[in-house]
């Protein structure tokens, strides 16, 4: 419990730099006041920090810059020499990925059997971070330039690039604007808006003989 890592920021774009500090409290009885603070990213070789100094309260601090984080998830360890080995002081988790690209190829079909408007899209490249997709919509007129009543959001389930708007939220023979919003810890994006009347995109079932 002698050490503590601070990371700024804990979630970055893949390839971006990360700054970290490791502090050792002055009342850490088991450590030498001149202990050399060491660092290890994942299972890479142990390395010293960029610089180490004493703070006014006696705390030792080591600073390190990881110039390019090329792991999508990694642990950063702060260590000190201990007898013939090293002692772990603290670990902190890093994540890296990308902000979501704009979802594309949004299309919708009105399913009369399930009585819902089912929309699907392509999510874009892998972000390596939890990314939510929300189907957003509002009622409008033919060109969808005017924003009428909003329709409750439809949150897509994980790894499912589709969502269903139930009949109760639809006004048939009335135009609506529909689009997808993608969001993760690094940013958000939106697909181009689709302007449609649900009755124009009815999926007809094959006739029963």
């Amino acid at each position: 419990s002698c050490g503590h890592i601070e990371i700024s920021p804990p979630v970055v774009r893949l390839g971006d730099p990360v700054l970290a500090s490791c502090t050792i409290s002055p009342n850490c009885s088991k450590l030498d006041q001149q202990a050399k603070i060491l660092w290890r990213l994942q299972d890479e070789p142990i390395q010293p920090g960029d610089r180490q100094h004493h703070l006014p309260d006696g705390t030792q601090e080591s600073l390190i810059t990881l110039p390019h984080l090329n792991y999508t998830q990694a642990f950063l360890f702060c260590l000190v020499p201990w007898e013939d080995s090293v002692q772990l002081l603290d670990q902190a988790e890093l994540h890296a990925g990308y902000p979501p690209a704009s979802p594309s190829n949004l299309s919708c079909l009105m399913h009369l059997t399930t009585n819902s408007l089912v929309c699907q899209w392509e999510p874009g490249p892998e972000t390596h971070l939890p990314t939510s997709f929300i189907l957003k919509s509002f009622r409008s007129r033919a060109d969808c330039q005017y924003q009428g009543d909003t329709i409750p959001d439809c949150v897509a389930k994980k790894r499912q690039n589709n969502c269903s708007i139930p009949r109760k939220n639809l006004l048939l023979y009335q135009y609506m604007a529909i689009w997808v919003q993608a969001e993760n810890m690094l940013g958000s994006s939106e697909s181009p808006k689709l302007c449609l009347d649900p009755m124009d995109v009815v999926k007809l079932e094959p006739p029963m003989l």
Partner: antibody, heavy 120, light 107 residues
Framework: EVQLLESGGGLVQPGGSLRLSCAAS???????AMWWVRQAPGKGLEWVS?????????LYADSVKGRFTISRDNSKNTLYLQMNSLRAEDTAVYYC?????????????WGQGTMVTVSS | DIQMTQSPSSLSASVGDRVTITCRAS??????LNWYQQKPGKAPKLLIY???SLQSGVPSRFSGSGSGTDFTLTISSLQPEDFATYYC?????????FGQGTKVEIK
């Protein structure tokens, strides 16, 4: 539904072995480091082990170091804990847990737990 | 290791009561404190992370405060489903450690 489901617990004699499994569903398992936490009967929670996304980095509590081995199979969305040389003090409910990204080891998803009883 | 001490270890309260649970760390842990709720035979559930951030889906009657060594979990108006055991957890330093728990019982 986001879910973790442990299995493999049971009654074992001191010195024996068990392998616990934790099956993940409803989230992208390969994005997350995973943890094992245990709770002795009527007691509090104790961290046991953690593993990074690739399986290349493992950490253990001093109380289990050298006896327990954590591993994962991302293709099967499954986390494992191999427990050898079991002792009476290892008797506990074992939970797997997933941390919330962007927080510092706050666990937002837990399994229902599997009971391990070490007794002769 | 950092010791986490919760008080009280148990308390009796009625529906509608304001309940406060405290957690004290053996050394400063900044705001690296999380709170969990656990019901008998169930897994813990994350309520609060980073001392005061409410986890998604958790009712707003739960709130957390504090920094350094002293932290508080407050339930503004106790509901029947809130009778459970509450744990604090520090994530400041290795190993991560938990408090011994506070059991909230029906008066």
């Amino acid at each position: 539904e986001v879910q973790l489901l442990e299995s493999g617990g049971g009654l074992v004699q001191p010195g024996g072995s068990l392998r616990l499994s934790c099956a993940a569903s409803g989230f992208t398992f390969s994005y997350y480091a995973m943890w094992w936490v245990r709770q002795a009967p009527g007691k509090g929670l104790e961290w046991v082990s953690l593993i990074d996304v690739s399986g290349g980095v493992q950490l253990y509590a001093d109380s289990v170091k050298g006896r327990f081995t954590i591993s994962r199979d991302n293709s099967k969305n499954t986390l494992y804990l191999q427990m050898n040389s079991l002792r009476a003090e290892d008797t506990a409910v074992y939970y797997c847990a997933k941390p919330l990204i962007g927080t510092r080891d706050a666990f937002d998803i837990w399994g229902q737990g599997t009971m391990v009883t070490v007794s002769s | 290791d950092i010791q986490m001490t919760q008080s009280p270890s148990s308390l009796s309260a009625s529906v509608g009561d304001r309940v406060t649970i405290t957690c004290r760390a053996s050394q400063s842990i900044s705001s690296y404190l999380n709170w969990y709720q656990q019901k008998p035979g169930k897994a813990p559930k994350l309520l609060i992370y980073a001392a005061s951030s409410l986890q998604s889906g958790v009712p707003s009657r739960f709130s957390g405060s504090g920094s350094g060594t002293d932290f508080t979990l407050t339930i503004s108006s106790l509901q029947p489903e809130d009778f459970a055991t509450y744990y604090c957890q520090q994530s400041y330093s290795t190993p991560r450690t938990f408090g011994q728990g506070t059991k909230v019982e029906i008066k």
